[in-house]
Interface confidence: low
């Protein structure tokens, strides 16, 4: 019988969507191009539920972790990489302090219990996030899972 | 168990100011996440976003109303104010005070305070 | 400022019908738009939030699909207390309300 795998080798499914956290580290800019080369998003959080998730994962594994949200185009408003805004809501998000801007950070990181704003040129880990597959009869997700990576060498 | 309950004069006169009071229960408008808002409805209208204030007293104004109006709380009476200035007859509507909830990322509108009617006239 | 207006501005119906009403943005809004649901001489009550969760309390006969700039709510089957007006509400952007929606008994 075949099994329906809703996200790629090595993905992780959350309430409808699939997560892959990298294993190595790139900037701010070559991380967005690593999840589009494997059909993802750096990660935008939309939910109470996702951000409690990806909060967990990224301080178990005690790494900092780039998410796609940045102030590049205008300082101090901060812009999801899908164009949306950051919500007035999710400023209970960001560790004690934070933003700061110290020293031109611009980009989003998960560190430790909350967000922190570093500067894009650090290599960091990062989270991508796609749709996950329906799984319908109809379609090619019922296959084995093939691995699917968005680790290339740093370049 | 939650409740907000608007306060204010019931007439007020064009070019006078007006002073709500939203009063407040069963939540702190210093968690953080919560927000408390001010909306109001026209007779036979639709519903009109005013003004808000956040927890930590970021405050957000409609565009078009914003040299107008301005809110405040007072986080140990659990009231949020709103002033309006130079008040027209157009501006007679039923007044609303609502609460976005803690927690959430988006910033909807959860409990309703039950409104109360101003009206604009000489 | 994003403007949210909704179709029909006035629907007649029946108990027991399958309701449609549509909330369009004049840009993207993702998921972050709300229904609620007000009777004569009462506040609004909230129904829906993030475009398809349904409040704690509501019937399940209510619910909410879309992102984007294109989104509906649905009650699956009329009942005599649902006839009302439903408002849409965006808040990607600040906010804005739709202009209303009235269901009235057939």
């Known amino acids: 019988e075949r099994l329906c795998h809703p996200c790629p080798w090595e993905w992780t499914f959350f309430q409808g969507n699939c997560y892959f956290m990298s294993n190595s580290q790139r900037n701010w800019h070559d991380s967005i191009t690593a999840c589009k080369e494997v059909g993802a998003q750096l990660v935008v959080i939309k939910s109470a539920e996702e951000q409690n998730f990806l909060q967990l994962q990224s301080s178990r594994s005690n790494r900092f972790t780039w998410m796609g949200l940045s102030d590049l185009n205008q300082e101090g408003t901060w812009q999801w990489v899908d164009g949306s805004p950051l919500l007035p809501s999710f400023k209970q998000y960001w560790n004690r302090g934070e933003p700061n801007n110290v020293g031109e950070e611009d980009c989003a990181e998960f560190s430790g219990n909350g967000w922190n704003d570093d500067k894009c040129n650090l290599a960091k880990f990062w989270i991508c996030k796609k749709s996950a597959a329906s799984c319908s009869r109809d379609e090619e997700q019922f296959l084995s899972p093939a691995p699917a990576t968005p680790n290339p060498p740093p370049a | 168990q939650v409740t907000l309950r608007e306060s204010g004069p019931a007439l007020v006169k064009p070019t006078q100011t007006l002073t709500l009071t939203c009063t407040f229960s069963?939540?702190?408008?210093?968690?953080?996440?919560?927000?408390v808002t001010w909306i109001r409805q026209p007779p036979g209208k639709a519903l009109e976003w005013l003004a808000l204030i956040d927890w930590d007293d970021d405050k957000y104004y409609s565009t078009s109303l914003k040299t107008r109006l301005a809110i405040s709380k007072d986080t140990s009476k659990n009231q949020v104010v709103l002033t309006m200035t130079n008040m027209d007859p157009v501006d007679t509507a039923t007044y609303y005070c609502a609460r976005t909830p803690s927690g959430s990322y988006g910033r909807y509108f959860d409990l309703w305070g039950r409104g109360t009617l101003v009206t604009v006239s000489s | 400022d994003i403007q949210m207006t909704q179709s029909p501005s006035t629907l007649s119906a029946s108990v027991g019908d399958r309701v449609t009403i549509t909330c369009r943005a004049s840009q993207s809004i993702s998921t972050w738009l709300a229904w609620y649901q007000q009777k004569p001489g009462k506040a609004p009550k909230l129904l829906i939030y993030e475009a398809s969760s349904l409040e704690s309390g509501v019937p399940s006969r209510f619910s909410g699909s879309g992102s984007g700039t294109e989104f509906t709510l649905t009650i699956s089957s009329l009942q005599p207390d649902d006839f009302a007006t439903y408002y849409c509400q965006q808040y990607n952007s600040y906010w804005t309300f739709g202009q209303g929606t009235k269901v009235e008994i057939k």
């Open positions: 069963g939540f702190s408008l210093s968690t953080s996440g919560v927000s």
